[in-house]
């Protein structure tokens, strides 16, 4: 799936147009520590701060940075080749809003890969930014071992063999 | 195959920390979750180890039990038991692929007594 | 967390008839829901998983539907084996971890007469 340059969700005055609330985007971790339901007001929040980034054709603008979605297949690190030799990085995860945000996006149902694999040497799950994952956030089913690597399909996210061939999402 | 241990009589406020032996299968591959029944009663899920090693917990059950694992175990502590812990303590293995959790293999459980 | 609502909490009926069981939960869990057999002073047995896939084994008598928040076990021609408590459980998680909570409905007896 390619997507045109901008946002697929239009925001007109802070709220969503033509945009249904996905139904499982959770809870929000608002500054104080006390939580909200996510909304599409949410969705299209800080989107005044967006205008200044400018995303290459084809793709895709949320909240100060840009996306491109692949309709190819590709093994893990192929994947990650293939968003390095572009200047970005397969997707981190940032926060709910930002995976609500993907969920969207995403049109099709079956795995693409995000920039998280399984390093033997920390034994944990590592963003491509070398940075642990939030196991108090995101939870990862299946295998946790060397060659796994973590693909989402819908609201899972799920640990797949590396040299396994899925879609992917760039990001910078 | 699966093997509670360590349920005993306990008085109240004493830790007491249950033991999941596994065999056949790596907790690295499998998650596994732990459940309780009390007398009489319905079962009563209490928490889950992942393949990584992170454990989540019902909400009743936070700060109430934590769970541990070694490369065979998955160990279940009670930190302040009260007579509500009174109950036969299970734990069970995930066998599902990632479309599902498929608790299909469970030990026979270990009674705790408190 | 979501609950789950597990109806009737007993139901007799005579051999070769059929009962139906039936599971609420509080929020939509998909098609994550398992099916549970259980015995006096044996563990559950898993009978269904995924709403409606039958565990290897599990005789065909034994049948799962539905999804979102409404589940119904049924168990056709039954037999004296059948007498038992049988039991829901909502194996529905998602990336974000405070939905990976596993309970279980408040159980069914069925006695079969």
């Known amino acids: 799936l390619l997507v045109s340059q901008g946002v697929l969700l239009k925001c007109q005055k802070g709220s969503c147009s033509n945009a249904t609330q996905y139904e499982d985007t959770g809870d929000l971790k608002v500054n104080n520590g006390t939580r909200r339901n996510i909304s599409n007001k949410d969705l299209c929040a800080s989107r005044s701060a967006d205008q200044t980034v400018l995303c290459q054709s084809e793709w895709l603008k949320y909240q100060g940075k840009c996306y491109w979605f692949s309709n190819e297949m590709k093994s893990w690190s192929d994947s990650y080749v293939y968003c390095l030799e572009r200047k970005s990085h397969l997707l981190i995860i940032h926060d709910q809003l930002e995976m609500a945000f993907i969920q969207k996006n995403l049109r099709q149902l079956n795995y693409v890969w995000i920039g998280l694999n399984f390093t033997s040497l920390k034994m944990t799950w590592t963003w491509v930014d070398g940075s642990p994952i939030d196991s108090k956030i995101f939870f990862i089913k299946g295998p946790a071992k060397e060659n796994s690597c973590a693909a989402i399909k819908e609201s899972k996210i799920f640990s797949e063999t590396c040299s396994s061939v899925f879609k992917w999402i760039c990001q910078y | 195959s699966l093997e509670e241990s360590g349920g005993r009589l306990v008085t109240p406020g004493t830790p007491l920390t249950l033991t999941c032996t596994v065999s056949g299968f790596s907790l690295s591959n499998n998650g596994m979750i732990w459940v309780r029944q009390a007398p009489g009663e319905g079962l009563e899920y209490i928490g889950i180890m992942n393949t990584d090693g992170s454990a989540y917990f019902a909400s009743w059950a936070k700060g109430r039990f934590t769970i541990s694992r070694t490369s065979t175990t998955v160990d279940l502590k009670i930190t302040s038991p009260t007579t509500e812990d009174t109950a036969t303590y299970f734990c069970?293995?995930?066998?599902?692929?990632?479309?599902?959790?498929?608790?299909?293999?469970w030990g026979q459980g270990t009674l705790v007594t408190v | 967390d979501v609950v789950m609502t597990q109806t009737p909490s007993s139901a007799s009926e005579p051999v070769g008839g059929t009962v139906t069981i039936k599971c609420q939960a509080s929020e939509s869990i998909s098609s994550d829901l398992a099916w549970y057999q259980q015995k006096p002073g044996q563990p559950p047995k898993l009978l269904i998983y995924?709403?409606?896939t039958l565990e290897s084994g599990v005789s065909s008598r034994f049948k799962g539907s539905g999804s979102g928040t409404e589940f119904t076990l049924t168990i056709s021609d039954l037999e004296c084996a059948d007498a038992a408590t049988y039991y829901c459980q909502s194996t529905y998680y998602s990336w974000y971890s405070s939905k990976c909570v596993f309970p279980f409905g408040g159980g069914t007896e069925v006695v079969v007469k």
């Open positions: 069970a293995r995930d066998a599902g692929s990632n479309d599902h959790f498929v608790f299909s293999l």
């Open positions: 995924g709403a409606s």
